[in-house]
Each structure stands twice: as structure tokens, then as C-alpha cells.
């Protein structure tokens, strides 16, 4: 059994998240994840889900009762979602930490908008290496 | 020329984002996007970038001077990033709108954590097409 399971059970106790009423009014994440089978679609959704958990864990980082559990789960997310790639994790965290109310950040974001938009769709990336073209071709029918 | 370009230029004027000093201290998004070539990695990063822009636009939604520009750009994001798929866009917005400080949301999130974690790595998805099995084989040593 993955170590995160035990630690997630510990978090369930801490948050009273095992109570029957927790399942009322549908799920937050699970039904959404079931809707998406394509890897790139799943990553769009999982990216938001992971950033939600990171924010949640940040809010409770000083609580000694769950610190070990939180750190174990964060490590497992690092391994599973970021494939233990520290650069990927660091870039992700940079993006999640930008303040949308900071006027300098706002100006930079608007300044970069045209270039960001130009790269949003998979077809937009020109001159990529053959493997990416192979992925695109393979996904064309999906 | 894509219609969003003209509207993004309008936003630049509004935010004084064309000033030379905007480029100081590096980029917010562009350097990060340059680091990632694989489609699934790009989606992880673009997901955060798109949610940032959506939050930014929400903060200025009542400003008549840029309302048309914002709507045009949001529509173009919908086409390019969500492939005009309303369900994809709706699921994404649901995820971005969950409040991390709401105790009911916290409890649900912790309740779902084990299942979310089980699906995080590409290798975790059972019954997927052969390509996923190929990935699993490559990572079997872990």
C-alpha cells in the first residue's frame, strides 16, 4: 500500500471527512475527472486540482498533528504528478503564486497575452521535433 | 490577424502594458512555457496561466472600456484552449471556483484525496490504450 493512503486516512480523521454527510451534493473532483480520458485534458483538470490541494495544505502547514501526513502526500504528488521533476514543480508553483491584484503582475500578464494566446492550441507550435508531430498525428482522431 | 490581437492591444493601452519597463525582471509566463515541449506538460502550465487570466478578467468585468476586449479574448481562449468544448470549460471553471477556506469544501477534498492521488500519474489509468502501457513499462523500475 502506498504510504500516502495511511496519511490521507489521518487527514480524513483530522477534517472529519469520513462522516456520511461529506458525500452529499456530489463530488468536487471525482466526477469531473471521470469526464476526461485524454491525457492532455486530464492534465488541464488535474493542474487545478493539485493547486487546490497545495493551497489547502499551505493553510494547515503549521499544524503539527498533520504535518507529516501533509508532507508525505505532497511528496507523493511530486512523484506522481510532476514525475519527480523539480523544475516542473518549481515552474508550477511560480505560476500558482502570482498575485492577480498586483499591478506590476497585471501589466506583465497583459504584455505577454498575445504570445501566450498564440501558443494555446496544440496546432500553434511550429518547428517542434518529430516526436511531438507524431503525438499530434496520433491524437488527430481522438 | 486573429481578432484577439487587436483586443489584446487595447488591453495593453488600458493597463499601460506597452511601457518599456514592463519587461524588467523577466517574464511571468513566456520563459516557463519555453521550458515545456511535451503537450501534457504544457497543459499543466497553461491550465494555471488560463486560470490566472480568467481571474484577472473577472476583476475588471464591470469596466466598460475593456469589456468587449475581455469578452473577445475569453472567447478565443475558449476556442483555442478548450477546443470550443463547453463541458470542458465548465468543469475547469468549477475547479477554479472552489473556495479553499470553505470547511465543507475542505472535507470533500480530503474525502476524495485517495482516489484523486490514485489517478495522478499516467501509469495509474487502467484499461487505457497501448501507449499508456508503454509508459508503464518504462517506469517499472520505480
Amino acid at each position: 500500500q502506498d504510504p500516502y493512503v495511511k496519511e490521507a486516512e489521518n487527514l480524513k480523521k483530522y477534517f472529519n471527512a469520513g462522516d456520511p454527510d461529506v458525500a452529499d451534493n456530489g463530488t468536487l473532483f471525482l466526477d469531473i475527472l471521470r469526464n476526461w480520458k485524454e491525457e492532455s485534458d486530464r492534465k488541464i483538470m488535474q493542474s487545478q486540482i493539485v493547486s487546490f490541494y497545495f493551497k489547502l495544505f499551505k493553510n494547515f502547514k503549521d499544524d503539527q498533528r498533520i504535518q507529516k501526513s501533509v508532507e508525505t502526500i505532497k511528496e507523493d504528488i511530486n512523484v506522481k504528478f510532476f514525475n519527480s521533476n523539480k523544475k516542473k514543480r518549481d515552474d508550477f508553483e511560480k505560476l500558482t503564486n502570482y498575485s492577480v491584484t498586483d499591478s506590476n503582475v497585471q501589466r506583465k500578464a497583459v504584455h505577454e497575452l498575445i504570445q501566450v494566446m498564440a501558443e494555446l492550441s496544440p496546432a500553434a507550435k511550429i518547428g517542434k521535433r518529430k516526436r511531438s508531430q507524431m503525438f499530434r498525428g496520433r491524437r488527430a482522431s481522438q | 490577424q486573429d481578432p484577439y490581437v487587436k483586443e489584446a492591444e487595447n488591453l495593453k493601452k488600458y493597463f499601460n502594458a506597452g511601457d518599456p519597463d514592463v519587461a524588467d525582471n523577466g517574464t511571468l509566463f513566456l520563459d516557463i512555457l519555453r521550458n515545456w515541449k511535451e503537450e501534457s506538460d504544457r497543459k499543466i502550465m497553461q491550465s494555471q496561466i488560463v486560470s490566472f487570466y480568467f481571474k484577472l478578467f473577472k476583476n475588471f468585468k464591470d469596466d466598460q472600456r475593456i469589456q468587449k476586449s475581455v469578452e473577445t479574448i475569453k472567447e478565443d481562449i475558449n476556442v483555442k484552449f478548450f477546443n470550443s468544448n463547453k463541458k470542458k470549460r465548465d468543469d475547469f471553471e468549477k475547479l477554479t471556483n472552489y473556495s479553499v477556506t470553505d470547511s465543507n469544501v475542505q472535507r470533500k477534498a480530503v474525502h476524495e484525496l485517495i482516489q484523486v492521488m490514485a489517478e495522478l500519474s499516467p501509469a495509474a489509468k487502467i484499461g487505457k490504450r497501448k501507449r499508456s502501457q508503454m509508459f508503464r513499462g518504462r517506469r517499472a523500475s520505480q
Epitope: T72, E75, N83, N85, K86 | N35
Partner: antibody, heavy 124, light 112 residues
Framework: EVQLVESGGGLVKPGGSLRLSCAAS????????MHWVRQAPGKGLEWVSS????????YYADSLKGRFLISRDNDRDSLYLEMNSLGVEDTAIYFC?????????????????WGQGTLVTVSS | NFMLTQPHSVSESPGKTITISCTRG????????VQWYQQRPGGVPKIVVF?????PSGVPDRISGSIDTSTNSASLTISGLQTEDEADYYC??????????FGGGTKLTVLG
């Protein structure tokens, strides 16, 4: 002060086994991933194995063909490398090195700290 | 494979500048951090650049790291060469299975 001290090296015959240890001090061992790296005489650095701190994920160089096993004891602040079916090509200095905090709390730098190494000689 | 290729050796006179390249054979150089290590004869590897461009405290600013995506390579530059810079230098990165990869090493000789 961060310290890593390897032990357990020595002379062993081909086909034999050895268990290397790395005693860590000066940092919260249980929060950091750890690595083994080796260097054959007059050769370059070769990564051997890594292990995460809390979740027991283990990684090995493909060339080892399942002969080595990494483990750790967070209560004893120690990292281990069990080496089996040793061949002359495994003769090297084996270094233990500290990784980073894979939970991201106080990330640190991968391979910032190294031990002095322990010499393993495989010869008949 | 994921080889990191370095020149076997470089040599230059004191006070000059040298650059050691580290070219990635497969995979994209910018998608994984690159570290550089200095190893003097009989010594332990010492990190001189981490996370592509960062210098640990105590490492002089004569030493710098960079990434060039057009050549899919990383570089270590040492300016104002000194005799104590004479050592082997290794680049290091990762592959997509989270395996650590080292370059073959470059022997730097400071001409006397």
C-alpha cells in the same frame, strides 16, 4: 553542519555481496531524498540509485540489472545500499549524497552535500 | 539515450575565460534542471552551479551556468581563470524516468 559518512566498503570476491551504510547528521534526514553515486578508478561519476524521503520510491540505474537495493532508516538517519552478485566492474568509490526535500517545504539543492566515499574493490 | 556529452578536456592560460559545454542527446535541455560539479584530484565532487544558473554561497561569481535551447545544451563558464580552477567538471541532469544522468566529465587544465 551537514555530514554524510559512508562505511561498509572493502575487498570482496566476484559474485559476493556487500552492504554500504551512510550515516547522516546536521539536517532533518527524514525530509530529504538521498542518492548513491559511484566513481570507478580514473573514471567519471556514475549515478547508482536514489530514494525519496517519506514515500519509499526507489530508482536505480538501468545498468545494475536488479543487483542492488537501496533502503533507508529515518529513525537512525541512515541510508543503505545492498549490493549483490558483484563483478569487477563494480569496483569504485561509492558516495552518498543528499537530495532535496521532495515535499517542497524547504526544498534545498539536489547533490549539495556529499560524503567522502567508501572504496569497494571486487577482485579474486 | 539521454547522454550528456562534454568535451574530454579544455585548457587555457590564467586570467582567460573558458566555456565547457554539456549537450543533451535526447529530451529537451530546458525541461530538467542542470547542475555542475567540480572535482579536484582525490577530492569529493563539489556543486558549483545548481538549477541551471544558480551559484551556491561561497562559489565565486567568476563561475556561471547557462542554458542554450537552440543547441540543446548547458554551459559552464569560468572567467579570470586561476590555477585552483584546475579540476574535473561534470554536468548532471535527469531523464524522464527520474534517473540521474552525469556527463562524462571535462578535465580543465590551467596552463602554467
Amino acid at each position: 553542519e551537514v555530514q554524510l559518512v559512508e562505511s561498509g566498503g572493502g575487498l570482496v570476491k566476484p559474485g559476493g555481496s556487500l552492504r554500504l551504510s551512510c550515516a547522516a547528521s546536521g539536517f532533518p534526514f527524514s525530509r530529504y531524498s538521498m542518492h548513491w553515486v559511484r566513481q570507478a578508478p580514473g573514471k567519471g561519476l556514475e549515478w547508482v540509485s536514489s530514494m525519496t524521503s517519506r514515500t519509499n520510491h526507489k530508482y536505480y540505474a538501468d545498468s545494475l540489472k536488479g543487483r542492488f537495493l537501496i533502503s533507508r532508516d529515518n529513525d537512525r538517519d541512515s541510508l543503505y545500499l545492498e549490493m549483490n552478485s558483484l563483478g569487477v566492474e563494480d569496483t569504485a568509490i561509492y558516495f552518498c549524497a543528499r537530495g532535496y526535500d521532495t515535499s517542497g517545504s524547504d526544498s534545498g539543492v539536489d547533490f549539495q552535500y556529499w560524503g567522502q566515499g567508501t572504496l569497494v574493490t571486487v577482485s579474486s | 539515450n539521454f547522454m550528456l556529452t562534454q568535451p574530454h578536456s579544455v585548457s587555457e592560460s590564467p586570467g582567460k575565460t573558458i566555456t565547457i559545454s554539456c549537450t543533451r542527446g535526447r529530451g529537451y535541455i530546458a525541461s530538467y534542471y542542470v547542475q555542475w560539479y567540480q572535482q579536484r584530484p582525490g577530492g569529493v565532487p563539489k556543486i558549483v552551479v545548481f538549477e541551471d544558473t544558480q551559484r551556491p554561497s561561497g562559489v565565486p561569481d567568476r563561475i556561471s551556468g547557462s542554458i542554450d535551447t537552440s543547441t540543446n545544451s548547458a554551459s559552464l563558464t569560468i572567467s579570470g581563470l586561476q590555477t585552483e580552477d584546475e579540476a574535473d567538471y561534470y554536468c548532471q541532469s535527469y531523464d524522464d524516468a527520474n534517473h540521474v544522468i552525469f556527463g562524462g566529465g571535462t578535465k580543465l587544465t590551467v596552463l602554467g
